[in-house]
């Protein structure tokens, strides 16, 4: 079953300021995606997050899985360069985590590197991962163009929230100490589309908040997703089923520091891509190992 952690997620009544350490098993769908692109000299290394949809599939943002050296072209990384960690809590201690290589890397065919429209991708794992208390899929939303309603509260987790100055090598190698060794999470409200659009249109630079995106965060700043959180799931508790649903994927934000005032985080609106996701996974919704909330 999807979207039901063995450990109950925190109540959404109280607002969290900044990020908090997650308890192990709180976000059992959370994946750390490590990319080492050896096709370039010297090798490029970076990381992002993703969400487990089934024993074999990870949902993430397309920009996490594209080569970093040609900023105006979309070159998917080779599957050989991708490693996925599941059941990971502390990046310094990968011993308890399941690591898997990729069998396939699938970027959305319309992903636009200029404005990050259609920023969604899938990784098929080489071998199905065993599910358990710390490794469980999240639910996909219903197919609905509106996406999550304004002011709804959601949670997003990642290893990049605490310290935007941490180097990639520090995150990837297990022996180093950083401020975001332990998975962090933050609670954020969905921002009305018009408000977010206006906020970005008023900035210098060519920012486009499309209908395939939604925003989350606080006007006053102070809590946000940041570098290294890309591709991570923005989850909302579905009232009817009481399951956690991936409504968004960490996509982009303004040029200011993470958590700046009136700079909302922008997320891929997953509900616009449910059909595409099922099509790639090759399983009709009814027989899906994870599932869609009904």
């Amino acid at each position: 079953e999807c979207g039901q952690p063995s450990r109950s997620l925190p109540s959404l009544v109280k607002r969290i300021i900044g990020g908090r350490n997650a308890e192990p098993g709180l976000f059992p769908w959370q994946a750390l995606i490590v990319v080492e692109d050896t096709s370039r000299v010297p090798n490029d290394k970076w990381f992002g997050s993703g969400a487990l949809l089934s024993e074999s599939w990870i949902l993430t943002a397309a920009h996490v899985l594209r080569s970093q050296r040609r900023d105006t072209t979309v070159i998917p990384v080779s599957k050989e360069h991708v490693t996925v960690y599941l059941g990971l809590h502390d990046v310094r201690d990968k011993s308890g985590a399941v690591n898997s290589s990729a069998a396939r890397v699938v970027l959305h065919p319309d992903f636009n590197i200029q404005n990050y429209n259609h920023d969604i991708a899938l990784v098929q794992l080489q071998e199905p991962v065993p599910l358990g208390p710390h490794v469980m899929p999240v639910c996909l939303p219903r197919l609905e163009p509106e996406g999550p309603s304004p002011h709804m509260l959601g949670l997003v987790a990642g290893w990049g929230i605490s310290n935007p100055n941490v180097t990639v090598d520090e995150i990837i190698s297990s022996g180093t100490r950083t401020l975001s060794d332990v998975l962090q999470y933050v609670k954020l409200p969905v921002v009305p589309h018009a408000e977010c659009k206006t906020s970005y249109e008023s900035r210098s630079g060519n920012y486009s908040v499309t209908e395939n995106m939604f925003c989350a965060g606080y006007y006053e700043g102070g809590k946000d997703t940041c570098l290294g959180d890309s591709g991570g799931a923005f989850v909302i508790l579905d009232d009817l089923s009481q399951r956690w649903v991936v409504q968004g994927l960490v996509s982009w934000g303004g040029p200011e520091e993470c958590g700046s005032k009136q700079v909302y985080g922008v997320y891929t609106k997953v509900s616009n891509y449910v059909d595409w996701v099922w099509e790639q996974m090759g399983s009709p919704q009814g027989r899906a190992p994870g599932g869609t909330v009904s």
Partner: antibody, heavy 113, light 112 residues
Framework: QVQLKQSGAELMKPGASVKLSCKAT????????IEWVKQRPGHGLEWIGE????????NYNEKFKGKATFTADSSSNTAYMQLSSLTTEDSAMYYC??????WGTGTTVTVSS | DIVMTQSPSSLAVSAGEKVTMSCKSS????????????LAWYQQKPGQSPKLLIY???TRESGVPDRFTGSGSGTDFTLTISSVQAEDLAVYYC????????FGGGTKLEIK
């Protein structure tokens, strides 16, 4: 060690095509991008484009689209660049390089009637 | 395209002197995901192919003498030769690979 050996100098007529080769040794040829660069006196260095031999993926500088075509033969560890519809502007030294680091020996192309 | 501007276009120094040359890009070369500046420095001696000296703006390629140092981030970069040797006579080019690669016009180093 990594080496890129390029084919010999070419003297060509305007309108003709030429195919330059770049043979790689000392590393796994299929796994690294091969870039091509043009150098003309007084014009500095210009990036033409690149190919990833293992997949055949290519990227071209807009300026050279339609002029240059990249191919690669994994069995002989050789990358090729074909230049078509040659003009005197194509007279230059052409280099291949392994993504960023090691440069080939260079091939001089002269276009003259 | 990202425009790379090198200065000076040429300079002449005596052996043993310190020399610095500049490379400026029309936009930032710092990739926020890999946290690297995609800027390389190459040395091209007369009649030879270019040779990589520095990558990621400040990492010296193996085998390159430690008198060569790269520095800078974002849009402003510098190559410093702490004590110029006669064999350093060459043209020095910077290249960005953040986007479709472009080269600077080069700095020609002459030895007095």
């Amino acid at each position: 060690q990594v080496q890129l050996k390029q084919s010999g100098a070419e003297l060509m007529k305007p309108g003709a095509s030429v195919k330059l080769s770049c043979k790689a040794t000392g590393y796994t040829f299929t796994g690294k991008w091969i870039e091509w660069v043009k150098q003309r006196p007084g014009h500095g260095l210009e990036w033409i484009g690149e190919i990833l031999p293992g997949t055949g993926s290519t990227n071209y500088n807009e300026k050279f689209k339609g002029k240059a075509t990249f191919t690669a033969d994994s069995s002989s560890n050789t990358a090729y660049m074909q230049l078509s519809s040659l003009t005197t502007e194509d007279s230059a030294m052409y280099y291949c390089l392994r993504s960023e680091d090691v440069w080939g020996t260079g091939t001089t192309v002269t276009v003259s009637s | 395209d990202i425009v790379m501007t090198q200065s000076p276009s040429s300079l002449a120094v005596s052996a043993g002197e310190k020399v610095t040359m500049s490379c400026k890009s029309s936009q930032s070369l710092l990739n926020s995901r890999t946290r690297k500046n995609y800027l390389a420095w190459y040395q091209q001696k007369p009649g030879q192919s270019p040779k990589l000296l520095i990558y990621w703006a400040s990492t010296r390629e193996s085998g390159v003498p430690d008198r060569f140092t790269g520095s800078g981030s974002g849009t402003d970069f510098t190559l410093t030769i702490s004590s110029v040797q006669a064999e350093d006579l060459a043209v020095y080019y910077c290249k960005q690979s953040y986007n479709i690669p472009t080269f600077g016009g080069g700095t020609k180093l002459e030895i007095k």
